[in-house]
Amino acid sequence: ELCDDDPPEIPHATFKAMAYKEGTMLNCECKRGFRRIKSGSLYMLCTGNSSHSSWDNQCQCTSSATRNTTKQVTPQPEEQKERKTTEMQSPMQPVDQASLPGHCREPPPWENEATERIYHFVVGQMVYYQCVQGYRALHRGPAESVCKMTHGKTRWTQPQLICTGEMETSQFPGEEKPQASPEGRPESETSCLVTTTDFQIQTEMAATMETSIFTTEYQ
């Protein structure tokens, strides 16, 4: 079941899926001047059995210079319903996401792919949030959102992350400051990580995650 809406936006924060649930679709988009190859797949699909998940279909782009159009490939109207865009900045994968049963890892980039990836998420998908550079977490409640089905409709849960650009915030006596980020920089000088004990992702995942999990930035 596809999720009806995009994950919620949080002011001054970005979100990222660590892994993609089976059933997730990724549009095969090509950068300007390129197009999907004739008879090429419209999308990649995360499929699998009980032991292994992987992306079906391959996205392939070819130069559109031989054609009389240089139009960029975009989803058809019926596909537009589920636009989840992400800017491709780095193919690095810090976590072995295939270790999460029923999930696919981030697909590797394909030649001449568009700068934004458009995902179609399914019920049960979880995304994680962090404050953008220059902002810090004033409050770091659950910083994730899950697509849930309730009363026959899909709904993303509301993340309880508040990002602030104000570096000087009051604090009441007798309470310790939250720990500095793993790199040892004060929180106000770095993005707020989601790898704190607040979020039970998976112990092995949490242990290996670094800021680079957010190199793919969601719009």
């Epitope: 409050h139 770091r140 409640g141 509301q158 993340p159 309880q160 650009g165 604090q171 009441f172 309470e175």
Partner: antibody, heavy 115, light 107 residues
């Protein structure tokens, strides 16, 4: 079910201080930040500030900076608002509200400042 | 600070009417906007969050729309229990500010 229960009405003299409480139940208290909002008689809603129930960090509206103090006691799942140097313009109903979207509110605490 | 301006400041409508309340932000706030309903002597109640998501338990006759600076709360078919004052509020950045309110009376 989620509940935010506030302390009772207060009558104070100008110049005095005031501390009101908001006790959360039916959810994990430290998952949600707590906001304080007030409403003067016949007026609209005015945001006072927000406190992280997890870290104790707080941000205040400029108008209340230095005069309002928000604290939390995690052991009792209670948030507090203290307001000093009270004046008649502070007469209002004070509300606590939970989370990013203010999805639950306390019933309100009526504060009257009068000589 | 971001100013939130609601219109109209008051309105009177009949049961069954379609009612629209608008809220304008003094700068782009994306979709970081909530709508609340307040009845006399009671605390405000969340109706819509993130501009268009209906809060749990809120009747489907309420809907929110808009993005950027212009937002709308619509009641598709007014019911007697919908009287009260409606407020918009942004959560884009602190200080979070409210609109001045729209008082809705039932004719």
């Amino acid at each position: 079910q989620v509940q935010l229960v506030q302390s009772g009405a207060e009558v104070k003299k100008p110049g005095a201080s005031l501390k009101i409480s908001c006790k959360g139940s039916g959810y994990t208290f430290t998952d949600y930040a707590m906001h304080w909002v007030r409403q003067a008689p016949g007026q609209g809603l005015e945001w006072i500030g927000v406190i992280s129930t997890y870290s104790g960090d707080a941000i205040y509206a400029q108008k209340f900076q230095g005069r309002a103090t928000m604290t939390v006691d995690k052991s009792t799942s209670t948030a507090y608002l203290e307001l000093s140097s009270l004046r008649s313009e502070d007469t209002a109903v004070y509300y606590c509200a939970r989370g990013v979207t203010f999805d639950y509110w306390g019933q309100g605490t009526t504060v009257t400042v009068s000589s | 600070d971001i100013q939130m301006t609601q219109s109209p400041s008051s309105l009177s409508a009949s049961v069954g009417d379609r009612v629209t309340i608008t809220c304008r932000a003094s700068q782009d706030i994306s979709n970081y906007l909530e709508w609340y309903q307040q009845k006399p002597g009671k605390a405000p109640k969340l109706l819509v969050y993130n501009a268009k998501t209906l809060a749990e338990g809120v009747p489907s006759r309420f809907s929110g729309s808009g993005s950027g600076t212009d937002f709308t709360l619509t009641i598709s078919s007014l019911q007697p229990e919908d009287f009260g004052t409606y407020y918009c509020q942004h959560h884009y950045d602190t200080p979070y500010t409210f609109g001045q309110g729209t008082k809705l009376e039932i004719k």
